[in-house]
């Protein structure tokens, strides 16, 4: 008897069993399970992933696929040999010994086996193509990874080197900062000590200065007395010599030329050999009346008689006609020399006027007039100026032709207003004109847009109040 059975064993493998009499034939087919299910990225018909997988994992899986492929190939070869060697004999025996229906069964088994083999071959071809494709991709990725790795390694090396450099630099700078902090602390301590010492010194110097000022006043008075006494003595000597000498004398007495003891301006003082800037006594022309002035022996060759100075607002310049006529303030600081003296002095010789200006931003400028004089009081000390040069504007900021001098109590300007009252200070106001160096003193940051400040229009504009000004005169032929 014979029969045919198709079944699955305990391991899940498919098997074909043919019973023919006492003989039983069992065919075990190769496992298709080794080709993973579609959920796997490596399923034979699955779409390949583009993203590169972990390199070691890829190599492992590739080896597994290669092993499966080799096993399948070997099994197929064995199956072929087996069919060729054994089945021929068996088939002959079966054909001879079994009934017609058994033949049909065998044909079915054969067909099934052939179909399975063909399918298996197709699958293997697919797997082979996939493996080749995957291998090529993996090789490319491997190459790219290798290049990237090299680049990254180089960058890491560079960065490590930079980090080391920066760490070194940082350590160096930290050390420097610590050193500087130490030095700074020392310096601060030293400066505090110096400050304390200076304060003590300043206190001492202040008292010394006070003493010196007192002595200076005394010395000045003494000096004036001495000068007068010397002058009187010389006159007495001269008159005695005149009396002693007679027309019939056989010998004449040599009279020593009197040394100059009075000076009309600082130029004469400079020429006498006194070349240090400071306060000197000047004598009115054709008079014994004296006045104290500051002589600038440094600027532009020296010999300058300072007629006006502003520097700190310590002196009020909103004064009367009389005060401007006679002068006010301190020649050591802010002052006005006096219109009467300047008028007399400039009326006798040709003088130049230099005006020095300072703004609050540290800039300096000057205006130089090559001829300057003041008319007498009867003409309200009218100013006359010609020949402007300098850096404080190409146009004169003292109105041309000259204006009369005006003060708060003597309005001689050309305005329907009272310029001196409005703009503050005595000046050669026009109506009211482009300048007023005797205006209200304004400190820094309060010095702009000031109607009544210290103004020099053609240098700083109409509302700017200057920091410091000096007006000085010197003979044109100095």
């Amino acid at each position: 008897y014979s029969n045919f059975r198709k079944s699955v064993d305990s391991t899940g493998r498919r098997q074909y069993q043919v019973q023919n009499g006492p003989c039983s034939y069992t065919f075990l087919l190769p496992e298709t399970d080794s080709c993973r299910s579609s959920s796997s990225p490596y399923m034979s018909n699955a779409v390949q992933r583009d993203a590169p997988l972990d390199y070691d994992d890829s190599v492992q899986r590739l080896q597994v696929l290669e092993n499966i492929l080799e096993n399948n190939t070997q099994w197929l070869m064995k199956l072929e040999n087996y069919i060729q060697d054994n089945m021929k004999k068996e088939m002959v025996e079966i054909q001879q010994n079994v009934v017609q229906n058994q033949t049909a069964v065998m044909i079915e088994i054969g067909t099934s086996l052939l179909n399975q083999t063909a399918a298996q071959t197709r699958k293997l071809t697919d797997v082979e193509a996939q493996v080749l494709n995957q291998t090529t991709r993996l090789e490319l990725q491997l190459l790219q990874h290798s290049i990237s790795t090299n680049k990254l390694e180089k960058q890491i090396l560079d960065q490590t080197s930079e980090i080391n450099k920066l760490q070194n630099k940082n350590s160096f700078l930290e050390q420097k900062v610590l050193d500087m902090e130490g030095k700074h602390s020392e310096q601060l301590q030293s400066m505090k000590e110096q400050k304390d010492e200076l304060q003590v010194l300043v206190s001492k110097q202040s008292s010394v200065i006070d003493e010196l000022e007192k002595k200076l006043v005394t010395a000045t008075v003494n000096n004036s007395l001495l000068q007068k006494q010397q002058h009187d003595l010389m006159e007495t000597v001269n008159s005695l010599l005149t009396m002693m000498s007679s027309p019939n004398s056989k010998s004449s007495v040599a009279i020593r030329k009197e040394e100059q003891t009075t000076f009309r301006d600082c130029a004469e003082i400079f020429k006498s050999g006194l070349t240090t800037s400071g306060i000197y006594t000047l004598t009115f022309p054709n008079s014994t009346e004296e006045i104290k002035a500051y002589c600038d022996m440094d600027v532009g060759g020296g010999g300058w008689t300072v007629i006006q100075h502003r520097e700190d607002g310590s002196v009020d310049f909103q004064r009367t006609w009389k005060e401007y006529k006679e002068g006010f303030g301190s020649p050591l600081g802010e002052y006005w020399l006096g219109n009467e003296f300047v008028s007399q002095l400039t009326g006798q010789h040709r003088y130049v006027l230099k005006i020095q200006l300072k703004d609050w931003e540290g800039n300096e400028a000057h205006s130089l007039y090559d001829h300057f004089y003041l008319a007498g009081e009867e003409s309200n000390y009218r100013i006359h100026l010609t020949g402007l040069t300098g850096t404080a504007g190409k146009i004169s900021s003292i109105s041309q032709p000259g204006s009369d001098f005006s003060t708060k109590d003597s309005d001689n300007d050309k305005c329907i207003c009272k310029c001196s009252q409005m703009l503050s200070g005595g000046w050669w106001f026009d109506a009211c004109g482009p300048s007023n160096l005797n205006g209200q003193y304004y400190p820094q940051k309060q010095n702009t847009n000031k109607f009544n400040g210290i103004k020099w229009y053609y240098w700083k504009g109409s509302g700017y109040s200057l920091k410091a000004t000096t007006m000085m005169i010197r003979p044109a032929d100095f």
């Epitope: 109105s399 305005c415 207003c417 310029c419 109506a431 009211c432 482009p434 109607f451």
Partner: antibody
Framework: EVQLLESGGGLVQPGGSLRLSCAAS????????MSWVRQAPGKGLEWVSL????????YYADSVKGRFTISRDNSKNTLYLQMNSLRAEDTAVYYC??????????????WGQGTLVTVSS | QSVLTQPPSASGTPGQRVTISCSGS????????VNWYQQLPGTAPKLLIY???HRPSGVPDRFSGSKSGTSASLAISGLRSEDEADYYC???????????FGGGTKLTVLG
């Protein structure tokens, strides 16, 4: 005697232009800030523009900025106002005014008689 | 709307004293001089008071000006019929970089 004489006013269409002049005499023109002030019919005074003696500083009212230009010719003692892109609201009597104090913006002590500018289509 | 504020009108009888106020801010009245102008009907304005309180020559002493903080005022004493006019206050404004006027006050002399 201080005199200020304006000229150049008249009727102009919106978007048009006019140039006003002010001839000055009787004072040192080159020492004073000069201004233009206008007065719309039945309204108050409105300052228009100011120019400093050396033309270094020029100021305009917001209402005319970018349309009007003030200038002066000290050699001719003349002040000018060039008015462009004129609007109906620019209709007014335009006065030329001299500053009270030379080299300072102190208000106006002398005024011209005015020139009428009418902007209408 | 004017930068300086004035009452639109004021009135008084002959001989009376009238005061016109002018209110501003720190950038105009508060930091600059105030001027007052008189404009008689059909004429150009005329300077009446300059620099807060000064009178130009030719202006009667019946007119006086004063200033306190950001406000100014014009006082007219012994009012006369010829004082009937428009009065304007004016000052430079630092913020606007321009001259500003009040809206004007029309003074009427009654009777």
């Amino acid at each position: 005697e201080v005199q200020l004489l304006e000229s150049g006013g008249g009727l102009v269409q919106p978007g048009g232009s006019l140039r006003l002049s002010c001839a000055a005499s009787g004072f040192t023109f080159s020492s004073y800030d000069m201004s233009w002030v206008r007065q719309a019919p039945g309204k108050g005074l409105e300052w228009v523009s100011l120019i400093s003696p050396d033309s270094s500083s020029i100021y305009y009212a917001d209402s005319v900025k970018g349309r009007f230009t003030i200038s002066r010719d000290n050699s001719k003692n003349t002040l000018y106002l060039q008015m462009n892109s004129l609007r109906a609201e620019d209709t007014a009597v335009y006065y030329c005014a001299k500053d009270l104090i030379s080299f300072w913006r102190g208000g106006f002590d002398y005024w011209g008689q005015g020139t009428l500018v009418t902007v209408s289509s | 709307q004017s930068v300086l504020t004035q009452p639109p009108s004021a009135s008084g009888t002959p001989g009376q004293r009238v005061t016109i106020s002018c209110s501003g801010s720190s950038s105009n009245i508060g930091s600059n001089y105030v001027n007052w102008y008189q404009q008689l009907p059909g004429t150009a304005p005329k300077l009446l008071i300059y620099s807060d309180s000064h009178r130009p020559s030719g202006v009667p002493d019946r007119f006086s000006g004063s200033k306190s903080g950001t406000s100014a005022s014009l006082a007219i004493s012994g009012l006369r019929s010829e004082d009937e006019a428009d009065y304007y206050c004016g000052a430079w404004d630092d913020s606007l970089s321009g001259y500003v006027f009040g809206g004007g006050t029309k003074l009427t002399v009654l009777g």
